[in-house]
């Protein structure tokens, strides 16, 4: 689980370059309690 | 009633392991990420990491690289966490949280 | 890390009147696609926490609307317009621009 932060708010994980908060308007539940299906 | 229920509190000594639960009950817990947080006595939140069910990849904090463990047991609907080497500041409530349910919280005592 | 802070960490607030928590962020939340990702939390005693606020100004479902938030990118304040007997607890900014760090808490109580 290589994890490298970068200033720039995104990071390197498992080799690819993700912005870590950009899944928050998904339907994955990234947002801590937030219920999924509500209103986003 | 949907809810996460977790196991119950936990002592262990130093250097031990743990392995939290979190069971979701009228709820599938392999469907949405689910995050563990601890909160230190008297203290603040503090976020561990997040593991997507569906393909067990996982993002920690950096500090507990090394210190905790996520899984999903998919055919159980239940999660989990270990933590290893344990030392006494490990001493804490733990939270599961999925979508908008969070666990009732599990303390784990490190102490010899 | 972004580093949270709060002040006050201790709000002594009386019933029906309004209150307000400051959450300060060590680098800009606000991200280039217009989101700000900073996050009210609230834990009441003996409870587990819930999520209030989301993405600075969203309401959290069931969450009533006399809570507010706004700010800037570094600055943001949690309002409540009357404070009502069920509101103690301790209330905790949150950001997850980078991961998820918390700030340290404020202890809101009756007076």
């Known amino acids: 689980d290589a994890e490298f932060r970068h200033d720039s708010g995104y990071e390197v994980h498992h080799q690819k370059l993700v912005f870590f908060a950009e899944d928050v308007g998904s339907n994955k539940g990234a947002i801590i309690g937030l219920m999924v299906g509500g209103v986003v | 009633q949907v809810q996460l229920v977790q196991s119950g509190a936990e002592v262990k000594e130093p250097g031990a392991s743990v392995k939290v639960s979190c069971k979701g009950s009228?709820?599938?817990?392999?469907?949405?990420?689910v995050h563990w947080l601890r909160q230190l006595p008297e203290k603040g939140l503090e976020w561990i990491g997040r593991?997507?069910?569906?393909?067990?990849?996982?993002i920690y904090t950096p500090k507990f690289q090394d210190k905790a463990t996520l899984t999903v047991d998919t055919s159980t609907d239940t999660a989990y966490m270990e933590l290893s080497s344990l030392r006494s500041e490990d001493t804490a409530v733990y939270y599961c949280?999925?979508?908008?349910?969070w666990g009732q919280g599990t303390l784990v005592t490190v102490s010899s | 890390d972004i580093v949270m802070t709060q002040s006050p960490l201790s709000n002594p607030v009386t019933p029906g009147e309004p209150a307000s928590i400051s959450c300060r962020s060590s680098?800009?939340?606000?991200?280039?696609?217009?989101?700000?990702?900073l996050y009210w939390y609230l834990q009441k005693p003996g409870q587990s926490p819930q999520l209030l606020i989301y993405q600075m100004d969203h309401l959290a479902s069931g969450v009533p609307d006399r809570f507010s938030s706004s700010g800037s990118g570094t600055d943001f304040t949690l309002k409540i317009s009357r404070v009502e007997a069920e509101d103690v607890g301790v209330y905790y900014c949150a950001q997850n621009l980078e991961l998820w760090t918390f700030g340290q808490g404020t202890k809101v109580e009756i007076k």
């Open positions: 009228g709820f599938n817990i392999h469907t949405y990420y």
């Open positions: 680098k800009s939340l606000l991200h280039r696609n217009g989101k700000t990702y």
């Open positions: 949280v999925s979508s908008g349910y």
């Open positions: 593991i997507d069910p569906e393909n067990g990849e996982t």
